[in-house]
Amino acid sequence: TPLGPKWPEPVFGRLASPGFPGEYANDQERRWTLTAPPGYRLRLYFTHFDLELSHLCEYDFVKLSSGAKVLATLCGQESTDTERAPGKDTFYSLGSSLDITFRSDYSNEKPFTGFEAFYAAEDIDECQVAPGEAPTCDHHCHNHLGGFYCSCRAGYVLHRNKRTCSALCSGQVFTQRSGELSSPEYPRPYPKLSSCTYSISLEEGFSVILDFVESFDVETHPETLCPYDFLKIQTDREEHGPFCGKTLPHRIETKSNTVTITFVTDESGDHTGWKIHYTSTAQPCPYPMAPPNGHVSPVQAKYILKDSFSIFCETGYELLQGHLPLKSFTAVCQKDGSWDRPMPACSIVDCGPPDDLPSGRVEYITGPGVTTYKAVIQYSCEETFYTMKVNDGKYVCEADGFWTSSKGEKSLPVCEPVCGLSARTTGGRIYGGQKAKPGDFPWQVLILGGTTAAGALLYDNWVLTAAHAVYEQKHDASALDIRMGTLKRLSPHYTQAWSEAVFIHEGYTHDAGFDNDIALIKLNNKVVINSNITPICLPRKEAESFMRTDDIGTASGWGLTQRGFLARNLMYVDIPIVDHQKCTAAYEKPPYPRGSVTANMLCAGLESGGKDSCRGDSGGALVFLDSETERWFVGGIVSWGSMNCGEAGQYGVYTKVINYIPWIENIISDF
């Protein structure tokens, strides 16, 4: 009996019946044993087959076997109902060996030519399995020449048996207050040879509740408790389980904040596993009752550990903890069942007593002393001498706790002094210096500080004067002694003011002419306005129409009189404006340098002389009546003139204030 080739020789070849292609003899028996390398199989097919046909191939036959299994018994030329001929079929060994047996009996009715077959070794594809057979690998099977290997999906690891995929299902920690966990692949069958550990770990104070949901199917045994696959639940207090079978376990109230769930499976079975929905509970906190005029959010049936609520007050009410205001309030339930903060109150917003209005007053409209939400107050300024700037003075207590005007302003209104009021009515007289009466020149300011000078009150804390009058004190403003509200130069009855700062026009050059002879003094306090102390108005844009040639202005001061002494009583003179060219010409002759009179100056006086301002009047205002507003405004500042005051053909020269309105406004707004 030929053995045939054995591995590691090349495994391929030809087999034939004895005497092929001639007829085979009677009483023949031949056996070939073919062996392929491990991981290979043998393939065999016939190129010729002609054997005596007999019932169940009892006479002559070729038998193919692999191990103990007969693959085929062949005879005849073509297959019948009970006999098989190979035809074009290919035959495969079950393992790496194939036995071929040829036998002929003692007679043949006619000659038969036998068979010719070819064989070869080929790789077994272990990954291909017949229907109904267990797969080679749990997950992925990879064939290669002479063998195969298995691999697993993500989340699994290959068991040491090299075929089973065990789930990587340990170390999962659940920290949410509720959630779901299940066996791997649920609701599909769970993996074999796996050991899963799940942890639920909540903050201290919580208690975990486990509910088995949907379905439960873990391999069981009728007599032994969960010997194959099982589920166990462990807390710091006790162990629950093992669980297996098809019945959903009951709810488990663990009374613990930490739970460990263990699931172990063996190598067999096909079960869908389990699913747990877990929740948690804790000691509830007292139900929060909203304070009056407030509400709780969110509204819940109960509040447990980590739950929170906020308090929101109705419009016009504010959160207060005692006397202390809060923008927001949120309380959190603690593990001992108490709230972490006490409940605040929603108190009606109180804007508090309104601030005092300088030179004004406030009236409670809603009711005496009522300062709560929606209360109304009315500010007003002291009549006659002050007027309200910015708004109408009506303020409402708004929800933000601030008194707010109808324009939405939270700042106080401003009581601005009324300017240009005088007790005097102009009669147009142009002769004789006259004594001023109380209230005639309430803007008149006496400036003492080395020399005597004058100025005019602007607003309630500025004095307009000549630069040359205060030049020496520009760096020592506090040296200026400023007096107002009096007619008598030496009277002890006056309102004292002190200078905070002196601003001399940057274009003024001392001892080099009088161009830009203008200065502002900022007072360190506001003065109280009354009939004897009232500011002068600044000229409007249209003011030039009241300052044409021959229009009358009034100069006032305590300067030198005809007798050569400073006046004891405030004096004034009404004088006409002089044509600018005429004035320029008057000061072109020596001893005056050319260009003494500039466009920043205006001249006033009589050609015949005798009516003029003089030394000591410097810085005082030359004022004009605005007939449209019926207010007096400053058109000029006493600046310079002829050496001999009131000289014929010479005129008083005044700083032209209208040219300096932007400069004045800038200084006042900046400081």
């Epitope: 903890q321 005692g322 006397h323 205001p325 923008k327 927001s328 508090g352």
Partner: antibody, heavy 114, light 107 residues
């Protein structure tokens, strides 16, 4: 972490004004709460002076109302104390504190003396 | 103004003792009372607010109780680091006012 830090002169002459600054880090003064000035006299007596709230509203101790002003600069997260016409009786350690006193500054000592 | 009276200026205690510091308000302040601890050269430290709520980081041996006009700070197991001066404060109404302080010292 919420921190408060007072700063200001250690010495002020009588009749002058006192100005102190409290710089807050770790919390915005407009987010919530009242921001207080509290002083502690020699002998350890504590006196609440006033607060400015998250919205800018103020509340003052009536005993100081004519002399005190509390303001703030939200861009710098600072609030300020101004106390006018100081006398020797205003010599104390001045603290800024949040809310009811859950956080305090380390304090700044002020002496009023000519 | 509401006057907060801490009648005991000094209290003697031993480590491990339980001690109660009291404070009386001249009128009803609800539960709007706070307690502070101050050690020499340091600023006051918040202990308790709203009568019984512990400030963050304060050991649970410190407890507060009371309402209306009578309030108590209890230290259940006195430690050496608790030797300090204790002040109560009401924040119920303007002006906020403090007690005069109680110094806790070793027997």
């Amino acid at each position: 972490d919420v921190q408060l830090q007072e700063s200001g002169p250690g010495l002020v002459k009588p009749s002058q004004s006192l100005s102190l600054t409290c710089t807050v880090t770790g919390y915005s003064i407009t987010s919530d709460y009242a921001w207080n000035w509290i002083r502690q006299f020699p002998g350890n007596k504590l006196e609440w002076m006033g607060y400015i709230s998250y919205s800018g509203r103020t509340s003052y101790n009536p005993s100081l109302k004519s002399r005190i002003s509390i303001t703030r600069d939200t861009s710098k997260n600072q609030f300020f104390l101004q106390l006018n016409s100081v006398t020797a009786e205003d010599t104390a350690t001045y603290y800024c504190a949040r809310y009811w006193g859950d956080y305090w500054g380390q304090g700044t000592t002020l002496t009023v003396s000519s | 103004d509401i006057v907060m009276t801490q009648s005991q200026k000094f209290m003697s205690t031993s480590v491990g003792d339980r001690v109660s510091v009291t404070c009386k308000a001249s009128q009803n302040v609800g539960t709007n009372v706070a307690w502070f601890q101050q050690k020499p050269g340091q600023s006051p430290k918040a202990l308790i607010y709203s009568t019984s709520y512990r400030s963050s980081g304060v050991p649970d041996r410190f407890t507060g109780s009371g309402s209306g006009t009578d309030f108590t700070l209890t230290i259940s197991n006195v430690q050496s680091e608790d030797l300090a001066e204790y002040f109560c404060q009401q924040f119920n109404s303007n002006p906020l006012t403090f007690g005069g302080g109680t110094k806790l010292e070793l027997k």
